[in-house]
């Protein structure tokens, strides 16, 4: 997270980290006791999922292995459209004050809405500095028309843009698949942006979760 600050302790109990061994790979969110939602480009063969602590490496955190993941069937490695994936935990997460389910959206929030993006990704770019504490930054949803002025044809209609004019506030490496939460509901998953991260007036691009709630629910049901 560029130009952010540590999240208020325990304010993101649905935030998870996807680890490769002990190394941060991506962010994600807990949908229920068995399922994590993240970005399709975060796919690996096996995941270790960190839950229940704002601090990576905290021994009090839950760590659960996951071996099965289900990409959206329309994900394209060329255009990066439909960049979302469900990861099935090998054992159930224990819900607590620090481990809660995220609220999936019942509607798409409008441009101008203030949202929070969070993650353990690098706080500097292009040289990397990985924090141990979960970082947060507030950004505003940007209309597709305004975002298209920056990204032209790269923007697809299930992509959502967020940023602050003339500001560096953005996600970065390691934040992928993590949550953009607006008014208490999950509206986006970190997907992509320009590099180095935090170039003013280059918005972050997110998978627009409100367009995929049916696929999320159907997929969890199908692979119970």
């Amino acid at each position: 997270i560029i130009d952010g600050a540590p999240c208020a302790r325990g304010s993101h109990p649905w935030q998870v980290a996807l680890l490769s061994g002990n190394q941060l790979h991506c962010g994600g969110v807990l949908v229920n006791e068995r399922w994590v939602l993240t970005a399709a480009h975060c796919k690996m063969n096996e995941y270790t999922v960190h839950l229940g602590s704002d601090t990576l490496g905290d021994r009090r955190a839950q760590r659960i292995k996951a071996s099965k993941s289900f990409r959206h069937p329309g994900y394209s490695t060329q255009t990066h459209v439909n960049d979302l994936m469900l990861v099935k935990l090998n054992s159930q997460a224990r819900l607590s004050s620090m481990v809660k389910k995220v609220r999936l959206p019942s509607r798409c929030e409008p441009p101008g809405t203030t949202c929070t993006v969070s993650g353990w990704g690098t706080t500097t770019s292009p040289d990397v500095t990985f924090p141990s504490d979960l970082m947060c930054v507030d950004v505003k949803l940007i209309s597709p028309q305004d975002c298209t002025k920056v990204y032209k044809d790269l923007l697809e209609n299930s992509m959502l843009c967020a940023g602050i004019p003339d500001s560096k506030k953005n996600a970065c490496n390691g934040d992928s698949g993590g949550p953009l939460v607006c008014r208490g509901t999950l509206q986006g998953l970190v997907s992509w942006g320009t590099f180095p991260c935090g170039q003013p007036n280059d918005p972050g691009v997110y998978t627009q979760v409100c367009k995929f709630t049916k696929w999320i629910n159907d997929t969890m049901k199908k692979h119970r």
């Epitope: 790979h25 796919k43 032209k152 790269l154 992928s176 992509w192 942006g193």
Partner: antibody, heavy 122, light 108 residues
Framework: QVQLVQSGAEVKKPGASVKVSCKAS????????IHWVRQAPGQGLEWMGS????????NYAQKLQGRVTMTTDTSTSTAYMELRSLRSDDTAVYYC???????????????WGQGTMVTVSS | DIQMTQSPSSLSASVGDRVTITCRAS??????LNWYQQKPGKAPKLLIY???SLQSGVPSRFSGSGSGTDFTLTISSLQPEDFATYYC??????????FGGGTKVEIK
């Protein structure tokens, strides 16, 4: 330090296969994509394809589709490029390169291997 | 696929000269164009990314400009170590990543 180190020069007969390796060090291998670019003697640069080190997702140049395979071994932070049914016009220096970006999209090559000369001759 | 056309294909210049190389895309690529320098027997090296951003460690005599279809690499005062071949590439419509044909800068 941050680097990509490639395997040594190869001489192959037409119809044979070659497998070039590219070992990454000094950065988290699984966080970036590896691309392969070749350069025939006295010619320009030609993009061959790419692989995501974490997911194994590949994209290949259309003209090489069916002849090229890119793989990675995350345990050794090594990328491989295999080219089959070699022809004389595959004679080139083969480079691996790291793509810089974040998330699903990358924007430029910020680190290159030293190159591997592959000569195809009968 | 997007074609990238570089011009000139070669040029002769003297130390201290201002040198300009152009790269034209067959369709708009916004500002997703990069410039690389390659010396004989060596791998290419990134100079400019995003059409105009100077890569860390690259001397400030190198600059890039342009957006859409027309781009320029300028060396404000050519130094002996700048004699090399220069390539552009585009990352807007990928795959494939496409390169320009190269511009060889030789000593006059």
């Amino acid at each position: 330090q941050v680097q990509l180190v490639q395997s040594g020069a190869e001489v192959k007969k037409p119809g044979a296969s070659v497998k070039v390796s590219c070992k990454a060090s000094g950065y988290t291998f699984t966080s970036e994509g590896i691309h392969w670019v070749r350069q025939a003697p006295g010619q320009g640069l030609e993009w061959m394809g790419s692989i995501s080190a974490s997911s194994g997702d590949t994209n290949y140049a259309q003209k090489l589709q069916g002849r090229v395979t890119m793989t990675t071994d995350t345990s050794t932070s090594t990328a491989y490029m295999e080219l089959r049914s070699l022809r004389s016009d595959d004679t080139a220096v083969y480079y691996c390169a790291r793509a810089a970006g974040y998330g699903a999209r990358h924007w430029y090559f910020d680190l290159w291997g030293q190159g591997t000369m592959v000569t195809v001759s009968s | 696929d997007i074609q990238m056309t570089q011009s000139p294909s070669s040029l002769s210049a003297s130390v201290g000269d201002r040198v300009t190389i152009t790269c034209r895309a067959s369709q708009s690529i916004s500002s997703y164009l990069n410039w690389y320098q390659q010396k004989p027997g060596k791998a290419p090296k990134l100079l400019i990314y995003g059409a105009s951003s100077l890569q860390s460690g690259v001397p400030s005599r190198f600059s890039g400009s342009g957006s859409g279809t027309d781009f320029t690499l300028t060396i404000s005062s050519l130094q002996p170590e700048d004699f090399a071949t220069y390539y552009c590439d585009q990352w807007y419509s990928t795959p494939p990543i496409t390169f320009g044909g190269g511009t060889k800068v030789e000593i006059k």
